[in-house]
């Protein structure tokens, strides 16, 4: 077990803070909830603290919760491939570019680390080149979320990982908005981290609303499990 993994044996409170600017539309989001890495489970509620969110909530899911991939459930035979937990408590910097097909892109930079007993994800997001009447600024996405695979590989030069994956957002007219994600994670501290073999995270997310919440918000339930590496021979003969 890595030192960082020991911090995730129970339920951990999560705080998310985002400052965003998309085509000049500035906004802030605050999120709170908890994660349980034993089950790969996240429960979070996000509130736009600046009024109405200028982009659809589903376009921010990867920035919020795929930001705290340290809560992914890594099966016993894959624990030596869990970079995310191994970087804790000092944490990691997570940078992404998210390309929306036939539209603009988001660039994000986040620091994910423990502050006391709370896992904090502080994010800056900049979006450019979006069409004012497109699927994103035109709010044409359905309020739901599909399952995805998130592909992870080691980046030995930077002592971190590279990640890529594609999200499919459902559009109200029945079509799909594609969003191609390119991600890099590097540790904040200088302690040892686990550099993984190639594998992926399998994610399932459910979006809902709080009937008692008047502000623009999103409630998120997510399950994430690592896969893609088979048992070694030593595992088979135990």
């Amino acid at each position: 077990m890595s030192k960082g993994e020991e911090l995730f044996t129970g339920v951990v409170p999560i705080l998310v803070e985002l400052d965003g600017d998309v085509n000049g539309h500035k906004f802030s989001v605050s999120g709170e909830g908890e994660g349980d890495a034993t089950y790969g489970k996240l429960t979070l509620k996000f509130i736009c603290t600046t009024g109405k969110l200028p982009v659809p909530w589903p376009t921010l899911v990867t920035t919020f919760s795929y930001g705290v991939q340290c809560f992914s459930r890594y099966p016993d035979h894959m624990k030596q491939h869990d970079f995310f937990k191994s970087a804790m408590p000092e944490g990691y910097v997570q940078e992404r570019t998210i390309f929306f097909k036939d539209d603009g892109n988001y660039k994000t930079r986040a620091e994910v680390k423990f502050e006391g007993d709370t896992l904090v994800n502080r994010i800056e997001l900049k979006g450019i080149d979006f069409k004012e009447d497109g699927n994103i600024l035109g709010h044409k996405l359905e309020y739901n979320y599909n399952s995805h695979n998130v592909y992870i590989m080691a980046d030995k030069q930077k002592n971190g990982i590279k990640v890529n994956f594609k999200i499919r957002h459902n559009i109200e007219d029945g079509s799909v908005q594609l969003a191609d994600h390119y991600q890099q994670n590097t540790p904040i501290g200088d302690g040892p981290v686990l550099l993984p073999d190639n594998h992926y995270l399998s994610t399932q997310s459910a979006l809902s609303k709080d009937p008692n919440e008047k502000r623009d918000h999103m409630v998120l339930l997510e399950f994430v499990t690592a896969a893609g590496i088979t048992h070694g021979m030593d595992e088979l003969y135990k």
Epitope: N149, Y151, N164, F165, K166, L178, D180, Y182, N198
Partner: nanobody, 130 residues
Framework: QVQLVESGGGLVQAGGSLRLSCAGS????????MGWFRQGLGEERELVAC????????FYTDPVKGRFTISRDNDKNTVYLQMNNLKPEDTAVYYC???????????????????????WGQGTQVTVSS
């Protein structure tokens, strides 16, 4: 919406060759990593080979390495699969698939997963007799 149409399948004797083609229309062909998959009777659909947007990078699965060659012509919106030294175990329906991607690289594990692909052809049957 990208449409993909495969052709070139057929019946061939073991040791023979076939060249499959997949013609794309309705989108920017060069914006897609292209893959060839196959599905034998009662088997799961599996990746055979894939090629990056420009054609600079390719990937082959072990059973076809050294026998199959994937290539593309973006001016003709077409991807090819040259299959040599065919074996009876190559018998399957062969499908062409397109994965919209921003970078001109192959990510092996992403390309192996069917779920990465956005558009699929209807398939062409390849039968190799012994």
């Amino acid at each position: 919406q990208v449409q993909l149409v495969e052709s070139g399948g057929g019946l061939v004797q073991a040791g023979g060759s076939l060249r499959l083609s997949c013609a794309g229309s309705g989108g920017t062909f060069s914006a897609y990593t292209m893959g060839w998959f196959r599905q034998g009777l009662g088997e799961e659909r599996e990746l055979v080979a894939c090629i990056s947007r420009s054609g600079a990078s390719t990937f082959y699965t072990d059973p076809v390495k050294g026998r199959f060659t994937i290539s593309r012509d973006n001016d003709k919106n077409t991807v090819y699969l040259q299959m040599n030294n065919l074996k009876p175990e190559d018998t399957a329906v062969y499908y062409c698939a397109a994965d919209w991607t921003v970078i001109d690289e192959i990510t092996e594990q992403r390309s192996k997963h069917q779920t990465s692909y956005d558009y699929w052809g209807q398939g062409t049957q390849v039968t190799v007799s012994s």
